[in-house]
Amino acid sequence: ECVTQLLKDTCFEGGDITTVFTPSAKYCQVVCTYHPRCLLFTFTAESPSEDPTRWFTCVLKDSVTETLPRVNRTAAISGYSFKQCSHQISACNKDIYVDLDMKGINYNSSVAKSAQECQERCTDDVHCHFFTYATRQFPSLEHRNICLLKHTQTGTPTRITKLDKVVSGFSLKSCALSNLACIRDIFPNTVFADSNIDSVMAPDAFVCGRICTHHPGCLFFTFFSQEWPKESQRNLCLLKTSESGLPSTRIKKSKALSGFSLQSCRHSIPVFCHSSFYHDTDFLGEELDIVAAKSHEACQKLCTNAVRCQFFTYTPAQASCNEGKGKCYLKLSSNGSPTKILHGRGGISGYTLRLCKMDNECTTKIKPRIVGGTASVRGEWPWQVTLHTTSPTQRHLCGGSIIGNQWILTAAHCFYGVESPKILRVYSGILNQSEIKEDTSFFGVQEIIIHDQYKMAESGYDIALLKLETTVNYTDSQRPICLPSKGDRNVIYTDCWVTGWGYRKLRDKIQNTLQKAKIPLVTNEECQKRYRGHKITHKMICAGYREGGKDACKGDSGGPLSCKHNEVWHLVGITSWGEGCAQRERPGVYTNVVEYVDWILEKTQAV
C-alpha cells in the first residue's frame, strides 16, 4: 500500500536499520526509498523539546509486516518509503537549506559569488555530494562567500547543525545537470587497480556498472566475470574511487571488465532497473518466501509485487510435477545484491522490477522499430502526440513529444494566433488521425509556456512546453522520451528519425498515418553553407540528405527528431523550419534540445 503523507509528531518504534542525517523529512523519505531495505523512517525535526544532537536524524527502518507500532513524540515526523508506490521517483533535490551546516569531509574550499555558483561547482565536481556556502552576512570576515565542497561515505551528511548566515544543498548530478564527462564505454580485459570502497556480487558488468552509478562513493569499477581464474572472485564487482576521480593504473587481465560510474549521464540510462534474466544462474541470499510459479517471468512478477523482495531464483518444474509449476525463491540481502552467485545448477535468476520507477520512465524498452517502411506501426513512437486546435474547426496543428507525465515539448511557432490554451487538445497513443472522433479521449492544456526569447522560428528559441490539465498514465503506446543529458553533448547520433503527420511534399495535406523517415544529422558548419541568409546557431541542429528526398514538412512542426543511442531514445531536436521540404542541399532545421535542458527543467520543476 502506498502512503505518501508524512505523520507529524509520530515515531515508529523499533525496526532500525541505520541512522543518517538529512535536512528535511521529505529528503529522509527519498533516502529511505533509495536504501535497499528501508520501508519506513522516523525523522527528528529541530525543536526546543528535543536534544539538539538528535535534530535532523533520519532513522531508516524495516519490518516484515511493512509497518511498525506508532508512538507520539513531539518533533518526530514519520512516513513510508516510496518503494510501495507506483509513481516515478527522483533523487534530484534542488532545495537550498538556510542556516544549516551539513557536515562532511571538506575537501575543497573556494570563493563563490552565490550559493547557486557553489551548487554548480559541486555538481561539476566528481567527488562532491553536498556543499555549505557562507553568505556575505556571515560574521567571520575571512569565511564570507566561501564555498565548501563536501563528501561522505554515504552521500548524506555525517551531522547537520544550525549555523546562522550559511546555506547548504546537494549536488545536482542526479538532476542530469552535471557538465562532467560521461564515459559509457566498458573496457574488456581490464582491471582498474585503485582502492576499493565496496564490493558486491553481480551477474554481469552492466549490473556492476549500474550499482557503481548509484553508489555514492563509486567513480569506476572492475568486474570479474564467471570465467575469471580465481573462483572466489568470480562475479565480484569492485566499486572503486581515487583522488583524481580517474583510475590511476590500468592492468590488462583476461576475463575482467572495467568501466565508469554514469552519474553524470544518469537520466538517459536505466540505473536501478536490472531487467534481464540470468539462465543457469542461482542467486543466493536471505530467503523471503518460496512460491509456485509457471515461469521465470511469473517469478519476477511475484518478486516485483513483494515489497521486500530484491532478487529471485526460479527452478523450473521437473516434468509433470506440481501442475507444471516451478519453485520461485524470493530473496533479499543487506545491500540489494546476491550474497553469492552460482552457475550450472539450472536456476533462472533476476531482480525485482520495483526499482525501475527510480529510473526515468523514458529509458524502458519500447517496441522494436520496423525498418524500411515510411508508415509507422502502433507503439513505435509512443512519445509522439498530435496537437489539435478546435478553432475555427478541429484540425491537426502540430506534433509534440511527451517528456513527463504532465508535459509536452513542442515548437513555439505552433502557437502563432493561438489566443488561449482552451482551444488546444493533445491526443497521445494515436497512429491514424482517423481514430480521432468526437468521443476520443484527449488531454486539455492548462498552460502554454513559450521561450521568452522566441521571436520567429528562423531566429531560434523555437521551443514551447504544454502543461497538461491531467497526468498521462504511461502505457506501451504513450510514454515519455528522454531528454539528452548535458554530459552527452558530444555524442554523435547516427540513428535519427523524424516523425509526424505532416505533408509529404510542399503542396499536400496532413497524412492519416504517422510517417517516419530516417535522416542523418548535418554539422552546423555544413548547414550554415546551405542557409547563407540565416544564422545557424549552436542552439539549432540540422538534419537531411544532401540529395533531399526525405525531410520534415508542414504539419510536422513541434514533433520530435528522435535519436537512438545506447538502446535509449533521446529527443535531440524539435522540428522547426527549413527552406521548402526535402529539397536538395536544404536540410531541415531543428531546435537543439540539449541546449534547452536547463530551461525545460526550470519550467517543469518549478513549484
Epitope: D124, V126, A181, I183, E243, N490
Partner: nanobody, 124 residues
Framework: QVQLVESGGGSVQAGGSLRLSCAAS????????VGWFRQAPGKGLEGVSA????????YYADSVKGRFTISQDNSKNTLYLQMNSLKPEDTAVYYC?????????????????WGQGTLVTVSS
Amino acid sequence: QVQLVESGGGSVQAGGSLRLSCAASGYTFNNNFVGWFRQAPGKGLEGVSAIYSLGGSTYYADSVKGRFTISQDNSKNTLYLQMNSLKPEDTAVYYCAGAITWVPPLSHRRYTYWGQGTLVTVSS
C-alpha cells in the same frame, strides 16, 4: 616539473588547414583529460576540444564540430589538433592544457597545467 609546449601555429587563408601539436614532459597525457583552449583578441578563454585517452572519448565546442579533430600519440606523449576549413573567427592564441582530475571537458577552470600558447591567424 611539468611542461606543455605547443607548436604548429601560423597564418593561413580562410578555408585552409593547420595542425597544432603539444608535447608534454613531466605529465602523462595517457589516462588524463587533455584539451585545447583558445583566446581570441579581447575575449575570454574558450574550450575548443578535449580528449580522454581511455576509450578515446572526444569532446568539441559546437563552433568547431566537423572541422577540428583532436588526437593523441601516447608513445610520444603528444596531443594534436587538426584544424580544417579555418575561418577568420578561429583567429586566437591556442593553448594546450592538462587536467589531473575528472573534469567538465571544455571548462578551462578545471585544468591544472597549461602551455604558453601558439598564435593562429586566419585571414579572409
